[in-house]
């Protein structure tokens, strides 16, 4: 299962650093439904 | 008109497979993550996971690790989930969404 | 897993006045950067769902200023200034602080 380090925000999963809880700024589109950028 | 369409109904057997497609129209699809979730017969919302399209990265729910996979075929803007070993419980609509777009819903149906 | 508890369950409301739904999470969303990570949803009547209020108080585009939402790191309050008609359907609370899991839902319908 995935594990949590919730003081870093990261998440460690299959060996790798993921920033889960992107910020705002975050143009990759991680927030559920959320309109990013312009449509392309 | 920019929107995201998803393949239609089906209905399986318990322990078969079934692959959802969900294409962007008027969207590059392949720009922003795309997230799969699923709404239970009158129940309320559960994450599955996302892909990145650009590098095919996943994460998923725990719950649905060894359930769904993800995958994206950039060259046709389409992304994929499909489900193995399904059982009644899987019966739901499921949901792809990218950027703002939500697709329509597919309703998968498992039942002998 | 973050569990997250709505209240209540069904709501009739009047139109034009306002209208509250409560939600809770079993565990903070506020990470030490600031940002709190509390999202809320609305699910019209045969629709797919749309994000109204992310990251907990901003208003995604094309989202009325009549919605609003508050809370502390554990408990979250969305406001409706003056119900309209075309607020009817399903809320849902969600977090992502740890993957995504979302509240069971709050039905909202005219009285």
């Known amino acids: 299962d995935a594990e949590f380090r919730h003081d870093s925000g990261y998440e460690v999963h299959h060996q790798k650093l993921v920033f889960f809880a992107e910020d705002v700024g975050s143009n990759k589109g991680a927030i559920i439904g959320l309109m990013v950028g312009g449509v392309v | 008109q920019v929107q995201l369409v998803q393949s239609g109904a089906e209905v399986k057997e318990p322990g078969a497979s079934v692959k959802v497609s969900c294409k962007g129209s008027?969207?590059?699809?392949?720009?922003?993550?795309v997230h799969w979730l699923r709404q239970l017969p009158e129940k309320g919302l559960e994450w599955i996971g996302r892909i990145d399209p650009e590098n095919g990265e996943t994460i998923y729910t725990p719950k649905f690790q060894d359930k769904a996979t993800l995958t994206v075929d950039t060259s046709t803007d389409t992304a994929y989930m499909e489900l193995s070993s399904l059982r009644s419980e899987d019966t739901a609509v499921y949901y792809c969404?990218?950027?703002?777009?939500w697709g329509q819903g597919t309703l998968v149906t498992v039942s002998s | 897993d973050i569990v997250m508890t709505q209240s209540p369950l069904s709501n009739p409301v009047t139109p034009g006045e306002p209208a509250s739904i409560s939600c809770r999470s079993s565990k903070s969303l506020l990470h030490r950067n600031g940002i709190t990570y509390l999202y809320w949803y609305l699910q019209k009547p045969g629709q797919s769902p749309q994000l109204l209020i992310y990251?907990?108080?901003h208003l995604a585009s094309g989202v009325p200023d009549r919605f609003s939402s508050s809370g502390s790191g554990t408990d979250f309050t969305l406001k409706i200034s003056r119900v309209e008609a075309e607020d009817v359907g399903v809320y849902y609370c969600a977090q992502n602080l740890e993957l995504w899991t979302f509240g069971q839902g709050t039905k909202v319908e005219i009285k």
């Open positions: 990251q907990m108080s």
């Open positions: 969404v990218s950027s703002g777009y």
């Open positions: 008027g969207f590059n699809i392949k720009t922003y993550y």
